[in-house]
């Protein structure tokens, strides 16, 4: 058996004297009782302890013997009051009581801190009958004590609806300090003070705390638990832990990393998800956040065509969802696109630039200076125009679409002609005489058909009339562009 240097209740012989009204020799079997199961407890304590005042409940028996002598009051015998032992050791303690034989069916229950102990606990009750009384010994054993076994244990017995309660047996399990609060990892601003907390408990108390930074002790003198370490500020990452010391030894907390917040790393993998004539949808993979959450991102768009100005457009967006649609771009243009993101410390560098192109769109303006005139000799209508400015073509011109509507009494028909992009004139056959021809022209790219020009009207006379002058797109302010020849 293992004995402790600090036992408050010294181990007594298991049964130092005979039970009242019986002879020691009558009870020789009791000497082997604790070992009947083969279990060797680390500490064994006597159910009686002479000279110690009795504080348990007492039951006064109402029944008298043949000689009519009143029976002595029933009470648990004095026992050891306080057991101190180390974690993982075994312990056995017991309650004993002598009960007159007139009482039947007596049972003893064990309670800890006010709650009955049921089930899995190792409790054994042994009965030793004699002529007048039965000695009852209730043993409670724990093979490997843990901190959770700390507490006040009592025995209870019910007789005549009366409850007899033993004195408490206090079990104190001592061990290495146990952390109730350990330092937590933190992300801190450079050169800014912060606190770390460490708390550990026994028993035994007191528990003293030493702080460790990057394997070196911070405080020369220990602090009583709980301890708060104020770090005035760091310039680089550090690992902190705390040591908790008590009489049993020391326990070291987990090491926690204290990171210094920094600007984020630049985003990576900027990629083009989709392109239209005037917008580009991009996505990116955020870089390392610098130990501080991203707040927002900036998309920088730079004209990249060989002779473009290089104008820079900046679009701000939220950090999530790493996706942005860049709008208001020119069609069929090249752009360099970069992404930068920020946290509370500042902006990251710009991601590697990627080249992106918008697609062709339909022209945004109509052909200019549309002129229409009648060539009576060939019975044709000649149409001339100027192509839209390059920047507003929004793509490579593939041709023009000409709408000509012929209206005379009771007749109206629209015809569409497609002409190639080379040249800026077309000739259409007269469809109806003595009618008005209304001409409109739209430029066409692979991106689609642009807007039609303002209508230009010309009157086609009956055969034999003279061809005088052309009709053309009106100057601003002219209400009606009809010219009757």
């Amino acid at each position: 058996a293992i004995t402790e240097a600090r036992e408050e209740a010294k181990p007594y012989p298991l049964f130092p004297g005979p039970f009242p009204g019986s002879l020691q020799t009558d009870h020789t079997p009791l000497l082997s009782l604790p070992h009947a199961s083969g279990y060797q407890p680390a500490l064994m304590f006597s159910p009686t302890q002479p000279g110690r005042p009795h504080t348990g409940n007492v039951a006064i028996p109402q029944v008298t013997s043949v000689e009519s002598k009143p029976l002595p009051p029933l009470a648990f015998k004095h026992t050891v009051g306080h057991i101190i032992l180390s974690e993982h050791k075994g312990v056995k303690f017991n309650c004993s009581i002598s009960v007159p034989n007139i009482y039947q069916d007596t049972t003893i229950s064990w309670w800890k801190d006010g709650k009955e102990l049921l089930g899995a606990h190792h409790a054994i009750t042994q009965f030793y009958p004699d002529d007048e009384v039965t000695a009852i010994i209730a043993s409670f054993s724990i093979t490997s004590v843990q901190r959770s076994d700390n507490g006040s244990y009592i025995c209870k017995m019910k007789i005549n609806n009366e409850e007899i309660v033993s004195d408490p047996i206090y079990i104190e399990v001592q061990g290495l300090p146990h952390f109730t609060k350990q330092p937590e990892s933190m992300n801190v601003t450079r050169n800014t003070a912060f606190n770390l907390t460490c708390q550990a408990v026994g028993p035994p108390e007191p528990v003293n705390i030493f702080w460790v930074q990057n394997s070196s002790r911070v405080n020369e003198q220990p602090e009583k638990s709980p301890s708060v370490l104020t770090v005035p500020g760091l310039t680089e990452m550090a690992v902190f832990s705390c040591e908790a010391h008590n009489d049993k030894g020391l326990t070291v907390s987990k090491g926690v990393q204290i990171n210094i917040k920094a600007i984020p790393s630049p985003p990576t993998e900027v990629s083009i998800r989709n392109s239209t004539a005037h917008s580009i949808l991009i996505s990116w993979v955020p870089g390392f956040d610098g130990y501080s959450p991203f707040r927002n991102c900036s998309i920088q768009v730079k004209e990249a065509d060989p002779l473009s100005n290089g104008s820079v457009m900046i679009f701000n967006t939220s950090a999530l969802p790493h996706l942005y649609q860049i709008k208001q771009l020119q069609a069929l243009a090249n752009y360099s696109i970069g992404v930068s993101c920020m946290n509370e410390i500042g902006w990251s560098a710009v991601s590697p630039w990627i080249l992106a192109s918008t697609t062709e769109g339909a022209p945004s303006v109509a052909p200019l200076n549309v002129t229409v005139f009648l060539n009576e000799s060939s019975d044709n209508v000649d149409i001339r125009w100027m192509k839209p400015p390059t920047k507003q073509q929004d793509g490579e011109l593939v041709g023009y679409r000409i709408s000509h509507v012929w209206q005379s009494a009771g007749i109206s028909k629209e015809l569409l002609e497609e002409v190639g992009q080379n040249g800026s004139r077309a000739r259409i056959s007269v469809q109806v005489h003595n009618a008005t021809c209304t001409v409109r022209i739209a430029a066409v790219t692979r991106g689609g058909v642009g807007p039609f020009s303002d209508p230009v009207k010309i009157f086609i006379p009956a055969h034999g009339w003279v061809d005088y002058a052309p009709s053309s797109t009106p100057a601003p302010g002219n209400a009606d562009p009809v010219l009757i020849i």
Partner: antibody
């Protein structure tokens, strides 16, 4: 009013280096590409490369790789072109140019670099 | 790299005459051709930019046409003040490349 100021001339010895400057004013320096063009006396024009002051992105003519290095100083709105290991072939007028609306609209007055022993 | 072949190298015309300069490119550049005028001791000046667009303030006697690989620059009614070197510049792709130039003189 957009202006690109260049020193009129630089005289350098063969094998040496020269750093030609171009101070920009009258516009947002970081918002436009800056191009450099070479013109040998009585000859045509050659495009050397361009740099964007916003982020110092450069596009170089392979012919001038290792010969010309383009840099900018945003604080003074100045673009620089360093020419190294100079030979008589490098004697020329060097222009800084910025494009606007699809053409080389603004030119510096040019710096005549003469390589002579 | 797109090479630009400009012709003629020089020409001499009387005032009032028409001048035609041609540039041919080795790749299809769409309409990304520019035309520059350079007078002695001065930097070049842009006359016509991409898409045959006449620059603001440039007299209408200057014009250009062409698409793809063949481009023509024209001066109608040449004046004595038009004496200069003329260059074409393709701006479709990098590196930018210039024509070798045409020296215009007045007879």
């Amino acid at each position: 009013q957009v202006q690109l100021q260049q020193p009129g001339a630089e005289l350098v010895k063969p094998g040496a280096s020269v750093k030609v400057s171009c101070k920009a004013s009258g516009y947002t320096f970081t918002n436009y590409w800056m191009h450099w063009v070479k013109q040998r006396p009585g000859q045509g024009l050659e495009w050397i490369g361009r740099i964007h002051p916003f982020d110092t992105e450069t596009n170089d003519n392979q012919k001038f790789k290792g010969k010309a290095t383009l840099t900018v100083d945003k604080s003074s709105s100045t673009a620089y072109m360093q020419l190294s290991s100079l030979t008589s072939e490098d004697s020329a007028v060097y222009y800084c140019v910025i494009p606007a609306n699809g053409g080389f609209a603004y030119w510096g007055q040019g710096t005549l670099v003469t390589v002579s022993a | 790299e797109t090479t630009v072949t400009q012709s003629p190298a020089s020409l001499s015309v009387a005032t009032g005459e028409k001048v035609t300069i041609r540039c041919i490119t080795s790749t299809d550049i769409g309409d990304d051709m520019n035309w520059y005028q350079q007078k002695p001791g001065e930097p070049p000046k842009v006359l016509i930019s991409e898409g045959n667009s006449l620059r603001p303030g440039v007299p209408s006697r200057f014009s250009s046409s062409g698409y793809g690989t063949d481009f023509v620059f024209t001066i109608e009614n040449t004046l004595s003040e038009d004496v200069a070197d003329y260059f074409c510049l393709q701006s479709d792709n990098l590196p930018l490349t210039f024509g070798s130039g045409t020296k215009l003189e007045i007879k």
